[in-house]
């Protein structure tokens, strides 16, 4: 009878993570008597995957009944495959012996490659908000995929971005890989409703890429424009002055009225109106009792927006003159109002 050969018919096997890998192995003879063992890798550091003779291998099942003397099919199934299982697996026939069994013949090996899906891309923006015309960086990360080949694209509101850098780690062979990409985005005043999207395409995703998004509303700060106007006389000796705060984002805003440099009233923006572009408008009124003032009054609307240094706009109210509408005119959009009469 010809000497036993160990046949591993598959040079390579490709399995998706979470699935079961079947590693095929047959012997050409029932002689010599002795166990089959499966190893991952070769040489002294090889890892025992299955021993026909003894041991507990909960993830491994045999394709046929290996307890029988007449069995020549030593194929195994390994369940719940992860990228860490990738490697070359060897089916090795031993000859019965003492004190140890003697390695008799090895198969040529089967390379197990594991296809693992990338994790959902996580997009993160800068830690601090930035204002329009500034360039900000967004990062996108995805992990745990295999094989290494992967495609990453950036979009802003559906338009593909080109200013980005991408790295796939590690550079050499690994059981799984990670991708890290940084994109540069120039902010505009209209970006409150904008989205930045990181799109990852991989062979495991079957043409349905994964997306991670970041809303620019988390990143942008649109500083307000201020306009102070004097309204027609409402009553004898009273003048109504309004401060229109326009096109700001986010909503966090505190307004302070000063009369001749002295704080008259402080309020926080509450009932705001939202513009189509996502920015907000707000209006504050100040009712000034002119008879209480002998000299001209300098009214200042001071706004602290989103923790930034205050910006202000002033209006000179001439007490001697007959009150009439004065002030700077700036194009207004929808205005909200908030009235507090203080005498």
């Amino acid at each position: 009878e010809e000497e036993l050969q160990v046949i591993q018919p598959d040079k390579s096997v490709l399995v998706a993570a979470g699935e079961t890998a079947t590693l095929r192995c047959t012997a050409t003879s029932l002689i010599p008597v002795g166990p089959i063992q499966w190893f991952r890798g070769a040489g002294p550091g090889r890892e025992l995957i299955y021993n026909q003779k003894e041991g507990h291998f909960p993830r491994v099942t045999t394709v046929s009944d290996l307890t029988k003397r007449n069995n020549m099919d030593f194929s195994i199934r390994i369940g719940n495959i992860t990228p860490a299982d990738a490697g070359t697996y060897y089916c090795v026939k031993f000859r019965k012996g003492s004190p140890d069994d003697v390695e008799f013949k090895s198969g040529a090996g089967t390379e197990l490659s594991v296809r693992a899906k990338p994790s959902a891309p996580v997009v993160s923006g800068p830690a601090a908000r930035a204002t329009p015309q500034h360039t900000v960086s967004f990062t996108c990360e995805s992990h745990g995929f295999s094989p290494r080949d992967i495609t990453l694209k950036w979009f802003k509101n559906g338009n593909e971005l080109s200013d980005f850098q991408t790295n796939v780690d590690p550079v050499g062979e690994s059981v799984s890989y990670s991708i890290h990409s940084t994109a540069k985005v120039v902010l505009t005043r209209e970006d409150v409703h904008s989205q930045v999207i990181c799109e990852v395409a991989h062979v495991t995703l079957q043409g349905d890429p994964l997306r991670g998004t970041a809303n620019l509303s988390e990143t942008i700060r649109v500083p307000p424009t201020l306009e102070v106007t004097q309204q027609p006389v409402r009553a004898e000796n009273q003048v109504n002055v309004t401060c229109q705060v326009r096109k700001f984002y986010p909503q966090r805003l505190q307004l302070t009225w000063l009369e001749n440099g002295n704080v008259s009233r402080t309020e926080t923006a509450s009932t705001v109106t939202e513009n189509k572009d996502g920015t907000y408008n707000w209006m504050s009124w100040l009712l000034v009792n002119v008879s209480a003032h002998r000299d001209d009054v300098k009214l200042t609307c001071q706004v602290e927006h989103d923790g930034q240094p205050a910006v202000s706009k002033s209006h000179d109210l001439k007490v001697s003159a007959h009150p009439k509408e004065q002030g700077s005119n700036t194009a207004a959009e929808n205005t909200g109002s908030n009235e507090r009469n203080i005498y």
């Epitope: 002689i31 166990p35 003779k53 003397r69 007449n70 004190p99």
Partner: antibody, heavy 118, light 107 residues
Framework: EVQLVESGGGLVQPGGSLRLSCAAS????????MHWVRQATGKGLEWVSV???????YYPGSVKGRFTISRENAKNSLYLQMNSLRVGDTAVYYC????????????WGQGTMVTVSS | DIQMTQSPSSLSASIGDKVTITCRAS??????LAWFQQKPGKAPKSLIY???SLQSGVPSKFSGSGSGTDFTLTISSLQPEDFATYYC?????????FGQGTKLEIK
């Protein structure tokens, strides 16, 4: 059903010969090593011979040169040709299948009695 | 040849008892050791192979352990049908050899 049935035992004089048979059924006979084991009355078990799948044979010193094991796969039969029999060969002879992957015996026949006496 | 020595040669026990029979090989036999049960007038029955693997159909009250030269057979809870003679056998190399047997009797 997996079964082994021995036959051919009997009374024989010292120096005589006897041929034992073992009929196998219920399994692929050619794929298993087959053994003979004997047991003298009131004594323990003694392994007598083996014939491997490829026809290779082994014997202990006590029977070597006198006993010959053979197999006929086409007939699912195992044989033990016993020559130059001695009184000490008196025993029940069992055939057994080396059925486990490591050639451990898993199936035994019911035995056939061989008596060597003058 | 490899010598196999069993102890004790005989053993008395009661129903429900747990008993252990030992077998020692004269040299290392790896774990190529089998245990058999034999009742009077009957053929041996295979219980265990490779020291601890249960033959198909054998109840789990039988268990084997050991490697190298020292081996044990344990019967966890004796029943009337378990009273018999037990043999160990090495089958690592020819000639295969048996222990002299342990007769398990009812007390």
């Amino acid at each position: 059903e997996v079964q082994l049935v021995e036959s051919g035992g009997g009374l024989v004089q010292p120096g005589g010969s006897l041929r034992l048979s073992c009929a196998a059924s219920g399994f692929t006979f050619s794929s298993y090593d087959m053994h003979w084991v004997r047991q003298a009355t009131g004594k323990g078990l003694e392994w007598v011979s083996v014939i491997g799948i490829a026809g290779d044979t082994y014997y202990p010193g006590s029977v070597k040169g006198r006993f010959t094991i053979s197999r006929e796969n086409a007939k699912n039969s195992l044989y033990l040709q016993m020559n130059s029999l001695r009184v000490g060969d008196t025993a029940v002879y069992y055939c057994a299948r080396g059925g486990s992957w490591d050639d451990a015996f898993d199936i035994w026949g019911q035995g056939t009695m061989v008596t060597v006496s003058s | 040849d490899i010598q196999m020595t069993q102890s004790p040669s005989s053993l008395s026990a009661s129903i429900g008892d747990k008993v252990t029979i030992t077998c020692r090989a004269s040299q290392d036999i790896n774990n190529y050791l089998a245990w058999f049960q034999q009742k009077p007038g009957k053929a041996p029955k295979s219980l265990i192979y490779t020291a601890s693997s249960l033959q198909s159909g054998v109840p789990s009250k039988f268990s084997g352990s050991g490697s190298g030269t020292d081996f044990t057979l344990t019967i966890s809870s004796l029943q009337p049908e378990d009273f018999a003679t037990y043999y160990c056998q090495q089958y690592v190399s020819y000639p295969y050899t048996f222990g002299q047997g342990t007769k398990l009797e009812i007390k």
